[in-house]
């Protein structure tokens, strides 16, 4: 048990286990929406230079890939897996890898993934062959 842990009135932010140690937030790529050259590839790097400390300890890393008539974008953020994002549930939020899954959206091709390892949304996977791979 730590010799000193600050008190908190916000148990949602102050997450600790039975041992008294305080849970860390995740580290995720967080560039919001950026133009991307990722297209027709089995996997891509985010090319996001910002690794942010997520605001709350239960947040996970998320990536959203979108393609329409005009451009391709990649969005990288932290997000609470209990809440929807762009109207969709975050599937596989406990996964160590960010494996993209297509979502139905009018007027664009839309893929989203969530994962829970440091900077896991830096490497996004489209190929189905990766979906059964085990954590590193």
């Amino acid at each position: 048990i730590p010799p000193h842990v600050p008190k908190s009135v916000n148990s949602d932010v102050m997450a600790s286990d039975n041992g008294g140690a305080v849970k860390l937030p995740q580290l995720c790529k967080f560039c919001d929406v950026r133009l991307s050259t990722c297209d027709n590839q089995k996997s891509c790097m985010s090319n996001c230079s910002i690794t942010a400390i997520c605001e709350k300890p239960h947040e996970v890393c998320v990536a959203v890939w979108r393609k329409n008539d005009k451009n391709i974008t990649l969005e990288t953020v932290c997000h609470d897996p209990k809440l929807t994002y762009h109207g969709f549930t975050l599937e596989d939020a406990a996964s160590p890898k960010c494996v993209m899954k297509e979502k139905k959206r009018a007027g664009e091709t839309f893929f989203m993934c969530a994962c829970n390892m440091e900077e896991c949304n830096d490497y996004i996977i489209f190929s189905e062959e990766y979906t059964t791979s085990s954590p590193d």
Epitope: A21, L24, P57, P96, N116
Partner: nanobody, 124 residues
């Protein structure tokens, strides 16, 4: 015995600067990722910044990007936080914390030791 001792807090005007220090002892400083965490009055914890033990790779909360700089001097077992362009909302007790080793999975990642904190007040 692990000890983390913060210093450098105080009263500063908005737009001003402060440099916090955290003197570490009782463990091998060069083996651990270190963090600065803050708690504003009546609020929860906010994870401000972290730095790797070797290579000095750094991470920041989005609320402090471009204003705060974390650094460490492994030869002195000391962690630093340079805070510039301070705002009223930066008012908080600032703690340095040691991360438990070798955990990249969020569910297993923990802080195991904390300092007693140093108070930073930003007010005109």
């Amino acid at each position: 015995e692990v000890q983390l001792l913060e210093s450098g807090g105080g009263l500063v005007q908005p737009g001003g600067s402060l440099r916090l220090s955290c003197a570490a002892s009782g463990f091998t400083f060069t083996e651990y990722r270190m963090w600065w965490v803050r708690q504003a009055p009546g609020k929860g914890l906010e994870w401000v910044s972290a730095i790797e033990p070797i290579g000095n790779r750094t991470y920041y909360a989005r609320s402090v990007f471009g204003r705060f700089t974390i650094s460490r001097d492994n030869s002195k077992n000391t962690l630093y936080l340079q805070m510039n362009s301070l705002r009223a909302e930066d008012t908080a007790v600032y703690y340095c914390a040691k991360q438990m080793p070798g955990q990249k999975w969020m569910a297993k990642s923990r802080f195991d030791y904390w300092g007693q904190g140093t108070l930073v007040t930003v007010s005109s």
